[in-house]
């Protein structure tokens, strides 16, 4: 029988293998960001293209209001790359108190929001200094790992300095997840 295997001492029953094509997955690509208010002590979230060009959402994985919505529980690979563009800066020597971002660095965070839990959870974080770089600089930060996610979880990408995100090409800045 398909999905079953018989052994001399015991019987194991396997669920039929699920085709990869049926699994929830999404790949979102960069759009130009506009200034927005964001929560105190939280970096602003990026918004994304979800259907044009290389971007897609499939099999009940939906994108809405900066969030990827997880449609079923399971282990997901979650990833993002954000490319920052800027120019050499005179880096500030004063460390201002009460600032969520460390001066003179850029940070990307992949965050999980669960409605039943009051605080967002940081799943992944990457930081780079921008003080030692050349005159016109590009700095990609890539993050990716596997997480056990629950149906209804929401994922977003937060960055420390939204005005430095390189919006020009969809292969430079992206965000996605797929069920393993």
């Amino acid at each position: 029988l398909k999905g079953q295997e018989f052994a001399p001492s015991h019987q194991q029953v396997y669920a039929p293998l699920r085709a990869d094509g049926d699994k929830p997955r999404a790949h979102l690509t960069v759009v130009r960001q506009t200034p927005t208010q964001h929560l105190k002590n939280q970096f602003p979230a990026l918004h994304w293209e979800h259907e044009l060009g290389l971007a897609f959402t499939k099999n009940r994985m939906n994108y809405t209001n900066k969030f990827l919505l997880i449609p079923e529980s399971g282990d997901y690979f979650v990833y993002s790359q954000v490319t920052f563009r800027g120019m050499t800066s005179e880096c500030s020597e004063i460390r201002q108190a009460g600032r969520p971002n460390k001066p003179d660095s850029i940070t990307v965070v992949i965050t999980k929001v669960t409605d039943s839990y009051p605080e967002p959870t940081q799943l992944l974080m990457g930081t780079k200094s921008v003080c030692e770089v050349g005159s016109n600089w590009f700095q990609p930060i890539y993050l990716g790992a596997m997480f056990s996610l629950q149906e209804g979880d929401k994922l977003m990408v937060n960055v420390s300095d939204i005005s430095l995100v390189d919006y020009t090409k969809e292969d430079k800045t992206f965000f996605g997840a797929f069920l393993l």
Epitope: R32, Q33, T34, P35, T36, Q37, H38, F43, P44, R85, G86, M87, S89, E90, C91, S92, Q96, R99, P100, N101, K102, P103, D104, S105, I106, V130, C131, S135, N136, V159, S160, D161, I162, S163, L164, V165, D166, Y167, T168
Partner: antibody, heavy 116, light 107 residues
Framework: EIQLVESGGGLIQPGGSLRISCAVS????????VDWVRQAPGKCLEWLGV???????NYNSALKSRLTISKDNSKNTVYLQMNSLRAEDTAVYYC??????????WGQGTLVTVSS | DIQMTQSPSSLSASVGDRVTITCRAS??????LNWYQQKPGKAVKLLIY???RLHSGVPSRFSGSGSGTDYTLTISSLQPEDFATYFC?????????FGCGTKLEIK
């Protein structure tokens, strides 16, 4: 709604200094850059400098020795300080905010007149 | 510094006309070219960024094109509210630099 409002312009003596404020609303200075631009009467727009969300600054090298841009994130205000003013610094001074390459939103500007 | 040369410096046209303004950079600016509109007593408005991308809320009669050092702003059918001064600006290299503007007047 995104707004930038400049204040602090007026009549200044040659050799004096100015400190202009740019109060922003609708976004956070900790994650967005603010540029300063000026326009002298009958002249082209001139970019003065920028303060990035992460705190770094860049200046127009022609004016760098006389300019300081700073900000107070808690007050959502950016400041432009300019020293050793001369008649040719008479201009409308604008603050603007946007992405690394463009200025999406501008203030109405504040007029600075340098004259004795 | 990169020099931005904008032409013409002034232009008379009628409602419904198609208008083209050009901007030339002194070196390649890799498509980081923006266009702005300025009206007396009003805040400057971004129209087009990265050569050809329309800023949110800008009517589709505005379009941009170009590459390398040569760039163009086109208004396909002039409306009464389009009479204003237009500036180009390069965002490729600091210091950012502007063209000196094109004043678009009613014929």
């Amino acid at each position: 709604e995104i707004q930038l409002v400049e204040s602090g312009g007026g009549l200044i003596q040659p050799g004096g200094s100015l400190r202009i404020s740019c109060a922003v609303s609708g976004f956070s200075l900790s994650s967005y850059g603010v540029d300063w631009v000026r326009q002298a009467p009958g002249k082209c727009l001139e970019w003065l400098g920028v303060i990035w969300g992460f705190g770094g600054t860049n200046y127009n090298s022609a004016l760098k020795s006389r300019l300081t841009i700073s900000k107070d994130n808690s007050k959502n205000t950016v400041y432009l300080q300019m020293n050793s003013l001369r008649a040719e610094d008479t201009a409308v001074y604008y603050c603007a905010s946007g992405n690394f390459d463009a200025m999406d939103y501008w203030g109405q500007g504040t007029l600075v007149t340098v004259s004795s | 510094d990169i020099q931005m040369t904008q032409s013409p410096s002034s232009l008379s046209a009628s409602v419904g006309d198609r208008v083209t303004i050009t901007c030339r950079a002194s070196q390649d600016i890799s498509n980081y070219l923006n266009w702005y509109q300025q009206k007396p007593g009003k805040a400057v408005k971004l129209l087009i960024y990265y050569t050809s991308r329309l800023h949110s809320g800008v009517p589709s009669r505005f379009s941009g094109s170009g590459s390398g050092t040569d760039y163009t702003l086109t208004i396909s059918s002039l409306q009464p509210e389009d009479f204003a001064t237009y500036f180009c600006q390069q965002g490729n290299t600091l210091p950012f630099t502007f063209g000196c503007g094109t004043k678009l007047e009613i014929k």
